[in-house]
């Protein structure tokens, strides 16, 4: 159920996951000069049920005389059961924070973490694209990508977004609200058997997410 590849890159655009599906793993990586504490977690795991999801495990880094070069690997399912559960929540979370069922929020920063976070996404994960400053969006469909299972293989749908250098007249160039339209299927399906359950559920949740989050916070 893990997605094999990274989401596609779009010229002059950036993407972000607004929430992470249960089953998503985040490697516990430390920046140069630091390493994971001994017996520390290799990864964080988004777990839970439809009403509440949270990140199991905690990433912790400690000073190191030499750079930690241990290669992170995707943990096996049996490893996942043995990990100690520690819910990570940011202090002072606003009461109006919306949550998407079956998803975890971005984990709060941990001390001396690596610059880049390495996520292992699962099927049904959605990421949203926006043009970077100085570029404006030409939409031909949803500016999002979904990890789908097709013919037994995972793939990311192609976001229907083109970012042009022509300056936009609005206040913030290149700013677009993430699109989550249930009817806007980025690519046509073939006649083979396709596992669409996760995608359909995710799309419905994305529509809910747009209503509950974007329309109230992205104004």
């Amino acid at each position: 159920e893990l997605c094999d590849d990274d989401p596609p890159e779009i010229p002059h655009a950036t993407f972000k996951a607004m929430a992470y599906k249960e089953g998503t793993m985040l490697n516990c990586e430390c920046k140069r000069g630091f390493r994971r504490i001994k017996s520390g977690s290799l990864y964080m795991l988004c777990t839970g049920n439809s009403s509440h999801s949270s990140w199991d495990n905690q990433c912790q880094c400690t000073s190191s005389a030499t750079r930690n070069t241990t290669k992170q690997v995707t943990p096996q399912p049996e490893e996942q059961k043995e990990r100690k559960t520690t819910e990570m929540q940011s202090p002072m979370q606003p009461v109006d924070q919306a949550s998407l069922p079956g998803h975890c929020r971005e984990p709060p920063p941990w001390e001396n973490e690596a610059t880049e976070r390495i996520y292992h996404f699962v099927v049904g994960q959605m990421v949203y694209y926006q043009c970077v400053q100085g570029y404006r969006a030409l939409h031909r469909g949803p500016a999002e990508s979904v990890c789908k299972m097709t013919h037994g293989k995972t793939r990311w749908t192609q976001p229907q977004l083109i970012c042009t250098g022509e300056m936009e007249t609005s206040q913030f160039p290149g700013e677009e609200k993430p699109q989550a339209s249930p009817e806007g299927r980025p690519e046509s399906e073939t006649s083979c058997l396709v596992t669409t359950t996760d995608f359909q559920i995710q799309t419905e949740m994305a529509a809910t997410m747009e209503t509950s989050i974007f329309t109230t916070e992205y104004q």
Partner: nanobody
Framework: QVQLVESGGGLVQAGGSLRLSCAAS????????IGWFRQASGKEREGVSY????????FYTDSVKGRFIISSDNAKNTVDLQMNSLKPDDAAVYYC???????????????????????WGKGTLVTVSS
């Protein structure tokens, strides 16, 4: 876990200046946008300004452009907000916040408009008397 600690709030007369500081010990700055929100009594929390910890690009909401200046010291893990020509409308609790950058280390202003940041400070009160 990283904590955000604000300082520098206080009482100032209209037209005066204040400098807010946010200390983020242990934060890997170049993975985040770091900056400020504010919440006046009875109003929604609004994004004021941020700085991209990787490329140094900045954002200011319209009402503070030309009056506020955000800066960061990545070595000291601090972000400052220099507030000049303060107005009564600027009175609020100011919160330091951080949000993960998008792919390629980029960040867009619409993300900062969300109150749903990755981490919040407890806030510092700014009072502007007329």
């Amino acid at each position: 876990q990283v904590q955000l600690v604000e300082s520098g709030g206080g009482l100032v007369q209209a037209g005066g200046s204040l400098r807010l500081s946010c200390a983020a010990s242990g934060l890997t700055f170049d993975g985040y946008a770091i900056g400020w929100f504010r919440q006046a009594s009875g109003k929604e929390r609004e994004g004021v300004s941020y700085i991209n910890g990787r490329d140094g690009s900045t954002f200011y909401t319209d009402s503070v452009k030309g009056r506020f200046i955000i800066s960061s010291d990545n070595a000291k893990n601090t972000v400052d907000l220099q507030m000049n020509s303060l107005k009564p409308d600027d009175a609020a609790v100011y919160y330091c916040a951080v949000d993960r950058l998008g792919s390629r280390g980029a960040y867009v202003s619409s993300w900062w408009r969300s109150p749903d940041m990755d981490l919040w400070g407890k806030g510092t009160l700014v009072t502007v008397s007329s």
